[in-house]
C-alpha cells in the first residue's frame, strides 16, 4: 500500500495505490483511491508511467481527455466513470502486455487539493492448476497441468500424510512454450501415489502462487485449486 500526499501551495489530499500484477493477454486493474470530492467538475485524474513520454490516461471535467495519451496505451485504458465521484481513480488496462510492467503514478487534483502515489505493476502469466489421476500410467500417478505461466515457475509437490517429504525424486516437471512464444504450459507428474491421501501441486513465480489439491480415496476423488497474487503492497 502506498499512500501519497499532495504538493505545497494547495491543500494536500491522500492518494492510495496498491501494487498489483497483470496477466498478459487479459485485462488488468491498476488500483488507486483518493479523498472524494462532492462535485465532478473539479476532479482530474492523471495516470503516468515512468519512462513513457505521453500520459497513460487522463480524466477531467467528467470525461476522458486522451489527446496527450501515449500511443502504447491507445484504446486500452478506462477509468470506472461512475466511481470517480466516490474517490475511485483505478484504471482498467485492456489486453495487458509484458511491456506494461513498471512504475505508474496516480496523480489527482480535486477542489480540496492535489496528491499522488506510485504503483509497481508487474506483468506475467499465471493460471489455475488442475490435478488429475493419470490412468494411463503403469503405477498410481498424478498429473498437474496449468496452461499459462511466465516467467518460468517452480513446481513443488506436497502431501498431507507425508508432511515435509521431498517429492522431487518421484516427480517430473516440463515446460512447453505456447503458440505466442511467451507463456508456457506447465505439466508436472507425480509417481508412486498412495490412496487415502491429499496431494498438492504448488506452482509459483515472482508474480503468483497457485495450488491444486487432489484427495484420492477408494470411493471418490475431490479437487480444489486456488491462486494468489504475490506482492500486493499498498502505497
Amino acid at each position: 500500500l502506498i499512500i501519497g500526499f499532495g504538493i505545497s501551495g494547495r491543500h494536500s489530499i491522500t492518494v492510495t495505490t496498491v501494487a498489483s500484477a497483470g496477466n498478459i493477454g487479459e485485462d488488468g486493474i491498476l488500483s488507486c483511491t483518493f479523498e472524494p470530492d462532492i462535485k465532478l467538475s473539479d476532479i482530474v485524474i492523471q495516470w503516468l508511467k515512468e519512462g513513457v513520454l505521453g500520459l497513460v490516461h487522463e480524466f477531467k471535467e467528467g470525461k476522458d481527455e486522451l489527446s496527450e495519451q501515449d500511443e502504447m496505451f491507445r484504446g486500452r485504458t478506462a477509468v470506472f466513470a461512475d466511481q470517480v465521484i466516490v474517490g475511485n481513480a483505478s484504471l482498467r488496462l485492456k489486453n495487458v502486455q509484458l511491456t506494461d510492467a513498471g512504475t505508474y503514478k496516480c496523480y489527482i487534483i480535486t477542489s480540496k487539493g492535489k496528491g499522488n502515489a506510485n504503483l509497481e505493476y508487474k506483468t506475467g502469466a499465471f493460471s489455475m492448476p488442475e490435478v488429475n489421476v493419470d490412468y494411463n500410467a503403469s503405477s498410481e500417478t498424478l498429473r498437474c497441468e496449468a496452461p499459462r505461466w511466465f516467467p518460468q515457475p517452480t513446481v513443488v509437490w506436497a502431501s498431507q500424510v507425508d508432511q515435509g517429504a521431498n517429492f522431487s525424486e518421484v516427480s517430473n516437471t516440463s515446460f512447453e512454450l505456447n503458440s505466442e512464444n511467451v507463456t508456457m504450459k506447465v505439466v508436472s507428474v507425480l509417481y508412486n501415489v498412495t490412496i487415502n491421501n491429499t496431494y498438492s501441486c504448488m506452482i509459483e513465480n515472482d508474480i503468483a502462487k497457485a495450488t491444486g489439491d487432489i484427495k484420492v480415496t477408494e470411493s471418490e476423488i475431490k479437487r480444489r485449486s486456488h491462486l494468489q497474487l504475490l506482492n500486493s503492497k499498498a502505497s
Epitope: 479523498e35 472524494p36 462532492i38 465532478l40 467538475s41 467528467g62 466516490v86
Partner: antibody, heavy 115, light 107 residues
C-alpha cells in the same frame, strides 16, 4: 448493510434552533461525504450541503448559508446539521444521504415549526 | 446554479409499457447525472449514477442515457411497484441540484 438512522420528527418554536442527527452504521464512517437534503411537503428535493467526514471540510448551497451548519462526531459515527432562526418555511423533511452519489439515504426527520 | 428541467410533472402509463423521462441541464454536466426513485412516504433511492450506470441491485428494466445537457431515464416494462416520483440530479458542480420530479401514474 449500511444504515443511516435519523429521528422521526421534531417540533420546534419559530425563532428557535434545532440540531438534527444522522448516525451511520455498517461501514467505514470517515471516508465519505454526508449530504443533507430538504424536502417540503409535496415538493421536490433541495441540496443543503455536504460534509467530508474525515476532515470536517464542508460545502454549502449558498441558499442555506447562515441557516444550516454541518458538523461531525467521528467517535459516534454521527453527522449533525444545526438549523437556526427557524420559520414556517423551514418546516420540511430533512434527509441525510451518504457519499457523493447519495447511495444511501436516512429515513428523514420531519421538522415542524409551529408556535 | 445549474438548473435541471424535467419536462413532465406527471406521466401516465400502464403496466408493461415502456416509459421514458427526460431531463435537461442548463449547461454541460458531462455524464454527472443520477436518477432517484421516491415512493410515497419513503426516502429517495439511487437507481442510476453517472448517467448510465445502474446502481447495485437495481433491476435491469431501469436504464439511463445521455451526456452533456440531455438525459433520459427509461423503464422498459413498467411494473406496479414502479409508480413513484423520479428525480434527476447533477453532481457536476455545486450547488448540487435536482429536477422538480416526474410522477409516474397509472392511466
Amino acid at each position: 448493510q449500511v444504515q443511516l438512522q435519523q429521528p422521526g420528527s421534531v417540533l420546534v418554536r419559530p425563532g428557535a434552533s434545532v440540531k438534527l442527527s444522522c448516525k451511520a452504521s455498517g461501514d467505514t464512517f470517515t471516508t465519505y461525504w454526508m449530504n443533507w437534503v430538504k424536502q417540503r411537503p409535496g415538493q421536490g428535493l433541495e441540496w443543503i450541503g455536504g460534509i467530508y467526514l474525515n476532515s470536517g471540510s464542508s460545502e454549502y448551497n449558498e441558499k442555506f448559508k447562515g441557516k444550516a451548519t454541518l458538523s461531525v462526531d467521528t467517535s459516534s459515527s454521527t453527522a449533525y446539521m444545526d438549523l437556526s432562526s427557524l420559520t414556517s418555511e423551514d418546516s420540511a423533511v430533512y434527509y441525510c444521504a451518504r457519499d457523493s452519489r447519495f447511495s444511501y439515504w436516512g429515513q428523514g426527520t420531519l421538522v415542524t415549526v409551529s408556535a | 446554479d445549474i438548473v435541471m428541467t424535467q419536462s413532465h410533472k406527471f406521466l401516465s402509463t400502464s403496466v408493461g409499457d415502456r416509459v421514458s423521462i427526460t431531463c435537461k441541464a442548463s449547461q454541460d454536466v458531462s455524464t454527472a447525472v443520477a436518477w432517484y426513485q421516491q415512493k410515497p412516504g419513503q426516502s429517495p433511492e439511487l437507481l442510476i449514477s453517472s448517467a448510465s450506470y445502474r446502481y447495485t441491485g437495481v433491476p435491469d428494466r431501469f436504464t439511463g442515457s445521455g451526456s452533456g445537457t440531455d438525459f433520459t431515464f427509461t423503464i422498459s416494462s413498467v411494473q406496479a411497484e414502479d409508480l413513484a416520483v423520479y428525480y434527476c440530479q447533477q453532481h457536476y458542480n455545486t450547488p448540487l441540484t435536482f429536477g422538480a420530479g416526474t410522477q409516474l401514474e397509472l392511466k
